[in-house]
């Protein structure tokens, strides 16, 4: 039975969406992105204890083997389950263009 | 420019497919899976240094922010990019059945 979203490590310790405010300089984008100049980056951070937000059967296997062989098999990892798109104005060889990136901001998280 | 598959940490140290031999007992499946009784579990293990097998723009952002704020933002994580299916013979209320699981064995890996 899945524990779902109940974090056994305490509030906010388990895999969840975090927002990090970043400038283009922070992101290493200053040389090719013109706008927006600041980004609210949403990313997945936190621990993946047993049965917490398990993405699939593979995550379940990984956790079981991690408990068995912790030095060989790492615990599941907190990663995006889906993404939010974001439009950037970027430099091109011929000028500037608008480009939509579908894999830039995490929308929700799970453990894999 | 992406480094692609060249691991800067030395051979076998970066994110790649590993095979772990496991019994049904190891996997915690002994009470519901009848066959196979042993599984060659393929999973993604290894470090994700900068530009190594970056899955997407999000992974690139995460690595840049990790370098900037290592205590807040973890490095990208080695996870399956795709899966191989596997058929299990499992117990049911009425007997046994064959079930294909599409998300059980990692096929290849990337960093997210």
């Amino acid at each position: 039975a899945r524990n779902g979203d109940r974090c056994p490590l305490g509030p906010g310790r388990c895999c969840r969406l975090h927002t990090v405010h970043a400038s283009l300089e922070d992101l290493g984008w200053a040389d090719w992105v013109l706008s927006p100049r600041e980004v609210q980056v949403t990313m997945c951070i936190g621990a993946c204890p047993s049965q917490f937000r398990e993405a699939n059967m593979h995550a379940q296997i990984k956790m079981n083997l991690h408990r068995l062989k912790p030095d060989t098999v790492p615990a599941p990892c907190c990663v995006p389950a889906s993404y939010n798109p974001m439009v950037l104005i970027q430099k091109t060889d011929t000028g500037v263009s608008l480009q939509t990136y579908d894999d830039l901001l995490a929308k929700d998280c799970h453990c894999v | 420019a992406r480094n692609g598959d060249r691991c800067p940490l030395g051979p076998g140290r970066c994110c790649r497919l590993h095979t772990v031999h496991a019994s049904l007992e190891d996997l915690g499946w002994a009470d519901w899976v009848l066959s196979p009784r042993e599984v060659q579990v393929t999973m993604c293990i290894g470090a994700c240094p900068s530009q190594f097998r970056e899955a997407n723009m999000h992974a690139q952002i995460k690595m840049n922010l990790h370098r900037l704020k290592p205590d807040t933002v973890p490095a990208p994580c080695c996870v399956p990019a795709s899966y191989n299916p596997m058929v299990l013979i499992q117990k049911t209320d009425t007997g046994v059945s064959l079930q294909t699981y599409d998300d059980l064995l990692a096929k290849d890996c990337h960093c997210v």
Partner: antibody, heavy 118, light 112 residues
Framework: QVQLVQSGAEVKKPGSSVKVSCKAS????????ISWARQAPGQGLEWMGG????????NYAQKFQGRVTITADESTSTAYMELSSLRSEDTAVYYC???????????WGQGTMVTVSS | DIVMTQSPLSLPVTPGEPASISCRSS???????????LDWYLQKPGQSPQLLIY???NRASGVPDRFSGSGSGTDFTLKISRVEAEDVGVYYC?????????FGGGTKVEIK
């Protein structure tokens, strides 16, 4: 082609609040920022604030700080601008517009007339 | 706040003739990336504003090539090579270098 459809005209009493909605029809916000501006009768445009993906935190003009709240609900593709403590000088047409950051406002709502009168 | 000043206030034009609108900012809009954070908008009578030019000189999608933007730093110009009857309305420049975003007072273009 995405359109921004705003809620209808409002008549409000001084001291009250108004909440104007802005819905993306024929699509979502698709990764664009949403800015709000207003135009008093016969006057120019005045920027109030904006919100960028993932629509968590808004940026406001100092003039409106503490009186304006901009939010967005991605699930319904709707942005909102709430202005409180209304006074007669807030009588204006309020516009939402999608942009990239604060610039390139390429799609605008039809505008919502808000009249503040006792 | 950056103050945007437009001239002239009103511009009577003859169809087929060129027209030019000036916009001055109280401080430079040239970012260190080499781009000017200035847009031009047209508000036709009874309509919402529409984007003409972004980042100083880039024509927005669907905007006729008779519209062009030029200038750098604090002095900018919007030119219409051959005015058409449908070009009447109020033209606004807008700076997006820093918040609050500010607009010029507008230039009303009308047919003679």
């Amino acid at each position: 082609q995405v359109q921004l459809v705003q809620s209808g005209a409002e008549v409000k009493k001084p001291g009250s609040s108004v909440k104007v909605s802005c819905k993306a029809s024929g699509g979502t916000f698709q990764g664009y920022a949403i800015s709000w501006a207003r135009q008093a009768p016969g006057q120019g445009l005045e920027w109030m604030g904006g919100i960028i993906p993932p629509y968590a935190t808004a940026n406001y003009a100092q003039k409106f700080q503490g009186r304006v709240t901009i939010t967005a609900d991605e699930s319904t593709s709707t942005a909102y601008m709430e202005l409180s403590s209304l006074r007669s000088e807030d009588t204006a047409v309020y516009y939402c517009a999608r942009g990239v950051g604060e610039l390139h406002l390429d799609v605008w709502g039809q505008g919502t007339m808000v009249t503040v009168s006792s | 706040d950056i103050v945007m000043t437009q001239s002239p206030l009103s511009l009577p034009v003859t169809p087929g003739e060129p027209a030019s609108i000036s916009c001055r900012s109280s401080q430079s809009l040239l970012h260190s990336n080499g781009y000017n954070y200035l847009d031009w908008y047209l508000q036709k009578p009874g309509q919402s504003p529409q984007l003409l030019i972004y980042l100083g000189s880039n024509r927005a999608s669907g905007v006729p090539d008779r519209f062009s933007g030029s200038g750098s730093g604090t002095d900018f110009t919007l030119k219409i090579s051959r005015v058409e009857a449908e070009d009447v309305g109020v033209y606004y420049c807008m700076q997006a270098l820093q918040t609050p975003i500010t607009f010029g007072g507008g230039t009303k273009v009308e047919i003679k």
